[in-house]
């Protein structure tokens, strides 16, 4: 058993049918010595008396808020949560496996630049009685500070018969140098509590590996005289690290017909302009990627050809 | 990205082309190592990230873009002295900081060159003959060093009398390649920045 926060405790259970569970001793936070009784949750049934209460925690019915009283007055509370270990592996019932970029990915994180700021998000089908708390650091043995905000519900989607809820959090490394070569990964730890179930999820990454630039901005077309060709131009996104001559991007320019089946013409360039043939009803899209370290491509910025 | 990259104009900053080749070569070598050594811990998640140049050179600090020198988190400067003549500087007036930066890059390349050559000698003794260093990568390191053209003491190639542990050597190869790729990215950024300056 360990303390998650004041008066909230996590009991770790080896979870299998007929498991013996864990013996837990609760102590009433009071100078009083006698006349103390214990109850669980809203029940008025007295579970025991005395300053300590010994219980055998086996299943969720044994978890909850234990309260000690004296003469109708509440003295203190202890909330017991359960953390299930199933055949040596901690349960992952609360969050959905996003399966991207690989199986068992519960937390996904992205950064728009090298400033040390990043966003993580996760999915669940649970709508109520759900709380999250997020901590982060650079490295784990001698951790350096990363400050995270509160997790917030950022999107709701309908998936088949189910509703899916997306939560996200923003974090900022306390003293980040955009040009630094990372040798210790960022660690993100999310505590999830659903009713009386506790779970924790972790992700470990280098900022360089989670970079996804914003799409190029100010995408414009300039028709070339007496030609079907157009000059496409764009700019680096505002959120990208500066100076741009150091944090350079490379770009992919795509001409896509109305039909998805039509052949796509693609050009790769390090410049912020390109000359392409603009077909009728086609659209031109441009996306960006770090020129020197191949992490994710940005989403496409698009303009119609007409 | 496996697309052809245009060869720079002759008037361009001379080292830019070599640094681009370097990044391409080390990235290819790392990819090859990951595939060939799939049963070894060779992914970024599995290896220890060690920097053989730590406390010996200070490339990131010495080569910091002017715009980032206001960022206190970037000014972790270490006192290191370098020789300051080099042919990449020949065609332009350069500050002491730029000379320091390029000589730091040269020292990095020299250290990695020695490590890679020593390691290749061990890998050539492996009866499994599983992986060797790409000669192209070694040649590209050499070319960039020549373009930088700093006079510096030659570091003798390390020789070891004891029987090599091939498992450890291959893991060390992965560690070195990951670190060298990160340094090659920094070198490319620096050359691009200097070219634009």
């Amino acid at each position: 058993i360990w303390e998650l926060k004041k008066d909230v405790y996590v009991v770790e259970l080896d979870w299998y049918p007929d498991a013996p569970g864990e013996m837990v001793v609760l102590t009433c936070d009071t100078p009083e010595e006698d006349g103390i009784t214990w109850t669980l949750d809203q029940s008025s049934e007295v579970l025991g008396s005395g300053k300590t209460l010994t219980i055998q925690v086996k299943e969720f019915g044994d978890a909850g808020q234990y309260t000690c009283h004296k003469g109708g007055e509440v003295l203190s509370h202890s909330l017991l949560l359960l953390h299930k270990k199933e055949d040596g592996i901690w349960s992952t019932d609360i969050l959905k496996d996003q399966k991207e970029p690989k199986n068992k990915t519960f937390l996904r994180c992205e950064a728009k630049n090298y400033s040390g700021r990043f966003t993580c998000w996760w999915l669940t089908t649970i709508s109520t009685d759900l709380t999250f708390s997020v901590k982060s650091s650079r490295g784990s043995s001698d951790p350096q500070g990363v400050t995270c905000g509160a997790a917030t519900l950022s999107a709701e989607r309908v998936r088949g018969d189910n509703k899916e809820y997306e939560y996200s959090v923003e974090c900022q490394e306390d003293s980040a140098c955009p040009a630094a070569e990372e040798s210790l990964p960022i660690e993100v730890m999310v505590d999830a509590v659903h009713k009386l179930k506790y779970e924790n999820y972790t992700s470990s990454f280098f900022i360089r590996d989670i970079i996804k630039p914003d799409p190029p901005k100010n995408l414009q077309l300039k028709p070339l005289k007496n030609s079907r060709q157009v000059e496409v131009s764009w700019e680096y996104p505002d959120t990208w690290s500066t100076p741009h001559s150091y944090f350079s991007l490379t770009f992919c320019v795509q001409v896509q017909g109305k039909s998805k089946r039509e052949k796509k013409d693609r050009v790769f360039t390090d410049k912020t302009s390109a000359t392409v043939i603009c077909r009728k009803n086609a659209s031109i899209s441009v996306r960006a990627q770090d020129r020197y370290y191949s992490s994710s491509w940005s989403e496409w910025a698009s303009v119609p050809c007409s | 990205r496996n697309l052809p990259v245009a060869t720079p104009d002759p008037g361009m900053f001379p080292c830019l082309h070599h640094s681009q080749n370097l990044l391409r070569a080390v990235s290819n070598m790392l990819q090859k190592a990951r595939q060939t050594l799939e049963f070894y811990p060779c992914t970024s998640e599995e290896i220890d990230h060690e920097d053989i140049t730590k406390d010996k050179t200070s490339t990131v600090e010495a080569c910091l873009p002017l715009e980032l020198t206001k960022n206190e988190s970037c000014l972790n400067s270490r006192e290191t002295s370098f020789i300051t003549n080099g042919s990449c500087l020949a065609s332009r007036k350069t500050s002491f900081m730029m000379a320091l930066c390029l000589s730091s890059i040269y020292e990095d390349l020299k250290m990695y060159q020695v490590e890679f050559k020593t390691m290749n000698a061990k890998l050539l003794m492996d009866p499994k003959r599983q992986i060797f260093l790409d000669q192209n990568m070694l040649a590209v390191i050499d070319e960039l060093m020549q373009a930088l053209n700093f006079n510096s003491e030659t570091v003798p190639q390390k020789s070891s009398l004891e029987e090599p542990d091939f498992y450890k050597t291959k893991i060390k190869l992965c560690i070195l390649l990951h670190a060298f790729r990160i340094r090659a990215v920094t070198i490319d950024r620096v050359m691009s920045y200097l070219n634009a300056s």
């Epitope: 979870w15 299998y16 498991a19 055949d87 040596g88 592996i89 690989k102 | 599995e46």
Partner: antibody
């Protein structure tokens, strides 16, 4: 006393369907994940499928994915395996098993696919 | 096809010590715990070892398990006639959990 009893096995022709059941007793069935594992005659153990405690997620071996469906009815304390498009290589003893460090197995039910 | 490899058979005289190996990789045994089962002819598998080296109550201390790196082993000391059975190791893969990975199985013969 934890008990698992499989039923529904039998002899069927290739291409046919069969539904297996596993009746659970002696524990809170709705709290635990459940597996189906099979064993072809004279061969080793092969995992078939898993379902979470609340039925929210199911996982399958590649060899049965798209043909077999694992499900559960927690109100009836019963685990099911619906097997469609059966082939000769599905011939095996099918066991249901609890998920956990200490597991409980049923006695098994024989499925024979033969023309 | 099983990714946990066991020797097809091992044998020993009564009273001898035999060991069965179970070889995997970093993503399975290297990252997860190992179980061992005994299966007597015509019966369901019986759990012998869990969490690499733990014995459930009722399993004789002649059976012991261990794990090192990407492989595990089961040792039977003081071999007895009733130990003649098939033995299977089981683990998980970190990317396909909760799919059970079983070993290829080892037939133990008491000479």
């Amino acid at each position: 006393q934890v008990q698992l009893v499989e039923s529904g096995g039998g002899v069927v022709q290739p291409g046919a369907s069969l539904a297996l059941s596993c009746a659970a007793s002696g524990f809170t069935f709705s709290s635990y994940g459940m597996h189906w594992v099979r064993q072809a005659p004279g061969k080793g153990l092969e995992w078939v499928a898993f379902i979470r405690y609340d039925g929210s997620n199911a996982y399958y071996a590649d060899s049965v994915a798209g043909r077999f469906t694992i499900s559960r009815d927690n109100s009836k304390n019963t685990l099911y395996l619906q097997m469609n498009s059966l082939a000769a290589e599905d011939t095996a003893v099918y066991y249901c098993k609890t998920h956990g460090s200490h597991d409980n197995w049923g006695q098994g039910t024989m499925v024979t696919v033969s023309s | 096809q099983s990714v946990l490899t066991q020797p097809p058979s091992v044998s020993g005289a009564p009273g001898q010590r035999v060991t069965i190996s179970c070889s995997g990789s970093r993503s399975n045994i290297g990252s997860n715990t190992v179980k061992w089962y005994q299966q007597l002819p015509g019966t369901a598998p019986k759990l012998l070892i869990y969490y690499n080296d733990q014995r459930p109550s009722g399993v004789p201390d002649r059976f012991s398990g261990s794990k090192s790196g990407t492989s595990a082993s089961l040792a039977i000391t003081g071999l007895q006639a009733e130990d003649e059975a098939d033995y299977y190791c089981q683990s998980y893969d970190r990317y396909t959990h909760p799919a059970l990975l079983f070993g290829t199985g080892t037939k133990v013969t008491v000479l």
